[in-house]
């Protein structure tokens, strides 16, 4: 008799999830010599242990601690790039500027990027049919808690000037409810971080407005200033030109506003 299964509002676990995580771990540790000591089978076991047999609306940061411990990684604290609603450009940037890091350039971020997963209470099965949606079902689901945990740790590690790439095409350039707005901003350490520098990425080719004056950016500035961290903002009017200048900063066109 088929067992009754909880129907959640979100998509189910990504197909071939265990194989994908394991393969990504192997690939990452091969490419990054400083992580070659990592045992990927142990990483998968710790990942699995965080959510398997647990109610997918009752996951805690504590559940992920064994995985966090295995995935401990030191990135240069002054080369951190946060992003909000503009992941692709942020990743294109760090692919060229190899000594700067987004969360997804770290082992744990790389393992989970774009994946969904959840289990079921009291069974060792992975649920491939549906997983809880953050809004419609519950916030303490395996995916949300994972990203909250790794994002908090990533922000806590930052120092000097922390950069954040923001999407200037959105109605809320800074969104308090995003991972950046709800987790990372509040976990920057004022004793280590001197400045948060926002890069506002323009969408339209002829958009010459100063989006650093946007009310949501002013709200971000206020939050950051109250935390005793300086705030600065730069418009990136031409993201295509920006990437070209990252690739080739000696180019004469890179002496003008990007």
């Amino acid at each position: 008799v088929p067992r009754w299964r909880q129907q959640w509002s979100g998509p189910g676990t990504t197909k071939r999830f265990p194989e994908t995580v394991l393969a990504r771990c192997v690939k990452y540790t091969e490419i990054h010599p400083e992580m070659r000591h990592v045992d990927c089978q142990s990483v998968w076991d710790a990942f699995k242990g965080a959510f398997i047999s647990k109610h997918p609306c009752n996951i805690t940061e504590e559940d992920y601690q064994p995985l966090m411990k295995l995935g401990t990684q030191t990135v240069p604290c002054n080369k951190i790039l946060l992003w909000s609603r503009i992941k692709d450009l942020a990743h294109q940037f760090t692919q060229v500027q190899r000594d700067m890091f987004t969360l997804e350039d770290t082992l744990l971020g790389y393992l989970a990027d774009d994946l969904t997963w959840c289990g079921e209470f009291n069974t060792s099965k992975i649920n491939y049919q549906s997983c809880p949606d953050w809004r419609k079902d519950c916030s303490n689901n395996p995916v949300s808690v994972f990203w909250k945990t790794v994002s908090r740790r990533f922000a806590e590690a930052a120092c000097d000037v922390v950069h954040v790439m923001l999407n200037g095409s959105r109605s809320k350039i800074f969104d308090k409810n995003s991972t950046f707005g709800s987790v990372e901003v509040h976990n920057l350490q004022p004793e280590k971080v001197q400045t948060l520098e926002a890069w506002v990425i323009h969408g339209g080719r002829e958009d010459s407005r100063d989006l650093c004056q946007d009310p949501t950016i002013k709200e971000l500035e206020s939050i950051i200033s109250k935390r005793n961290i300086q705030f600065s903002c730069k418009n990136i009017y031409r993201p295509d030109k920006f990437l070209q200048c990252v690739k080739n900063p000696e180019d004469s066109s890179c002496t003008s506003e990007i």
Partner: nanobody, 124 residues
Framework: EVQLVESGGGLVQAGESLRLSCAAG???????MGWFRQAPGKEREFVAA????????WYGDSVKGRFTISRDNAKNTVYLQMNNLKPEDTAVYYC??????????????????WGQGTQVTVAS
């Protein structure tokens, strides 16, 4: 090619102030600027830097709260305001530029262009 020319060094008493200037031979747009210093027999030490916005700044621990880096983009000049100088601040001060102005760094080898240096001597 970015030509950097420092000025403003000299001999001062402990507790006094100095302002160093560094003029660049091209527009500052997108450049990140930094100041380093080197005392006799010691390694070059990070003092202060900014990013391409000109408003993001960070400092070496020994000068934090006493030194301020700033820039005037119209004049293509970066400044280092040094207050409450101490004898241990005595060194040759160098201005440096990064073509990748978005990078935050304290490492001298990540700067592309350097000035010739200006001597600062603080007497006790």
């Amino acid at each position: 090619e970015v030509q950097l020319v420092e000025s403003g060094g000299g001999l001062v008493q402990a507790g006094e102030s100095l302002r160093l200037s560094c003029a660049a031979g091209r527009t500052f747009t997108n450049l990140g600027m930094g100041w380093f210093r080197q005392a006799p027999g010691k390694e070059r030490e990070f003092v202060a830097a900014d990013t391409w916005s000109g408003t993001s700044t960070w400092y070496g621990d020994s000068v934090k709260g006493r030194f301020t880096i700033s820039r005037d983009n119209a004049k293509n000049t970066v400044y280092l305001q040094m207050n409450n100088l101490k004898p241990e601040d005595t060194a040759v001060y160098y201005c440096a530029a990064r073509l990748r102005g978005w990078i935050t760094t304290r490492k001298p080898n990540e700067y592309d262009y350097w000035g010739q240096g200006t001597q600062v001597t603080v007497a006790s």
